[in-house]
Structures are given as C-alpha cells and as structure tokens.
Amino acid sequence: TPEVWVQVRMEATELSSFTIRCGFLGSGSISLVTVSWGGPNGAGGTTLAVLHPERGIRQWAPARQARWETQSSISLILEGSGASSPCANTTFCCKFASFPEGSWEACGSLPPSSDPGLSAPPTPAPILRAD
C-alpha cells in the first residue's frame, strides 16, 4: 500500500520560516503534488503550492521556494509575516496524485516539543484520504 510522509521543520534562524518535506512511498508514477495548510486540500485547506513533474511549480504566498528533491519527494520553504505567517501548530498536508494508485494525502505539523531548527524524523504520517 502506498504511503505519504510529511516532515515539518521550523528554521532556527527565522522563527516564521518553515520547511515542509513530503514523500511518496509507492511504485506508481507521480502526476501532481499539492501542498496545503490548515487542513487537507479541498477540505478547508488552503493551497500553498502545486508541483507538476513536467510543467513546473505554481506557488502562493507565503510559499517561497518549492522544489522536487527526488522523483518521489518535494520540499517547500514558507516565510511568513503577520497574517500570512504559519504558527507552531499549523497543519500542513501533502497530496500525491499517482498512476495507477490514485491520490494519497497525509498531514503533519511541528512536533509539540520541537526546538527551532529541530524536527521529527520523516516518518509516514497518517493517511487521511486515498481517492
């Protein structure tokens, strides 16, 4: 069964800067990755970035730098201030659309006791939805 993992990290240098890393553990071909915050994409969450393997990357503030790390993982840097700034308990979700498995989504947030600059290891997060 495919799995999605999500890792959230707060940067030590800037407390309003977050790095989200997501990966897909499956054998299918990824066709699209959507990163959102505030809940799953399409269920109250707000899209931060859409990464297409061939067409490029479309991102919305406060997303600053999204990129493919490998063919099955992506990273996204957020830099916010004021109303658009993420906070420590913000939930970030990643949805991977793949063929032939379909869509798989997982969410994660900063570990409760994490110090700036630290993060939980990238373990698979609970899968919220598989379309």
Epitope: G56, I57, A66, W68, Q71
Partner: antibody, heavy 120, light 113 residues
C-alpha cells in the same frame, strides 16, 4: 489561431483606476491561465500575476498584490486587470499572455499590449 | 524570487556573424524530477510584443528558425544565433519558468552593423 486583443492606449489621471481588457479567441478560454506582464519604456519585463479563467483563482506577484486585481468574464472570453491608485510609476505597456499546456510559466501567446499613461 | 541576470546589455553584429548572449539565474532551474531546465528565451522586435523562442532551455518553439540555439543547465544559460540576419534586430529576454513568480532578465539589445 490564438489571438489576444488589447486596446492600444489609455490616458488616466493620477490617483484614479483603470481597467484593462484582453479578449481571447482561437482557443478554449478556460483551458489555460492568463498572465499579465508590465514593461516600462526601455526596460525589462515584470510578471504581475495570473488568473485561471475556469475557476477565477488568482496568483499575484507580491510586488503588485495591492496594485492589480485580475478578473475574467466567461461570456465574452475576456480577461481584465484593474490597476488602482495610479501614479507615474504605473505608466507602462501592459501585456496579457496565455500559455500552451506544456509549462505553467511559458508565455506562449501575447497580446499587442495596452500603453497606459498616467498624467494630470 | 529568482533573480535573472543577462549579459551583455547590448551588442552590435554584422549579418552572418555568430552571436552569443548569456543569462544567469540566482538559483538552479533544474527540475529534480525530470532533469529539465525551466528557462525560456523571448525576442522582442521594436514596437512589438515579445515572442517565445525557446523553452526548457533548448526546445525551440514551433516556427522558430534553427539558427536560434538555446543551451545551458543549472544556473548558466546561453542563446546563440548561429548566423545573424537583419531581421534579428531585437531585444532578447531570458525568463525562468521554474516557479512563481516567473522572472525575466534585463534583456540584451542586438543591433545590426
């Protein structure tokens, strides 16, 4: 073939607003995002933002998010950009551009541009 | 935002000469998924709107003469005109189409001697 029609020029007063139009023809209007680009005389190109005609979703360059508002009218296959609180810095040629389906941010088809002059 | 820097700002060449112009990006434009470089080149003739010449660093748009050759990878890119023609008089802009916001270089003005 793809055509993007823009008015040639607009003369507007400082402090006012202007709404520029871009009428699309030759393709399915809702099939690709519409981009807007600014070019000041003798200078380079700046991306203002984009709108998805199918659902009205927008994406702005942070520099222009309080200056430009993008909308579309499906019935006439026309995209609009409203520029507010105009100053001399807004005097420029404004292009609309759409893209083919191969990449998000290649500007494949361009309008002829609307020259906006802000002057009292 | 990704900063694009072009050089030279202008150059004058005779018909038939080979022309090269440079574009550098402040971060890599190489897509880690498919190893494509998301870099485009545009030509803007006097009084006209820009026209797409090359995308993905080296793919010519349809109808673009094969004397226009895009190359490079990562952060360093080049547009070469193998044998310049009088009708190539124009400004040339590079643009990263890697991510939002797409950004353009300041341009290279090509003059014909």
């Amino acid at each position: 073939q793809v055509q993007l029609q823009q008015p040639g020029a607009e003369l507007v007063k400082p402090g006012t607003s202007v709404k520029l139009s871009c009428k699309a023809a030759g393709y399915i209007f809702t099939s690709s995002w519409m981009h807007w680009v600014k070019q000041r005389p003798g200078q380079g190109l700046e991306w203002i933002g984009e709108i998805n005609p199918s659902d009205g979703r927008t994406n702005y360059n942070e520099k222009f998010k309080n200056k430009a508002t993008l909308t579309v009218d499906h019935s006439s296959s026309t995209a609009y950009m409203q520029l507010s609180s105009l100053t001399s810095e807004d005097s420029a040629v404004y292009y609309c551009a759409s893209n083919a389906d191969r990449a998000y941010y290649t500007m494949d088809y361009w309008g002829q541009g609307t020259s906006v002059t802000v002057s009292s | 935002d990704i900063v694009m820097t072009q050089s030279p700002s202008s150059l004058a060449m005779s018909v038939g000469q080979k022309v090269t112009m440079s574009c550098k990006s402040s971060q890599s434009l190489l897509n880690g998924f498919n190893q494509r470089n998301f870099l485009a080149w545009y030509q803007q003739k006097p009084g006209q709107s820009p026209k797409l010449l090359v995308y993905f660093a080296s793919t010519r748009d349809s109808g673009v003469p094969d004397r226009f050759i895009g190359s490079g990878s990562g952060t360093d890119f080049t547009l070469t005109i193998s044998s310049v023609q009088a009708e190539d008089l124009a400004d040339y802009f590079c643009q990263q189409h890697y991510s939002t916001p797409p950004t353009f270089g300041g341009g290279t003005k090509l003059e014909i001697k």
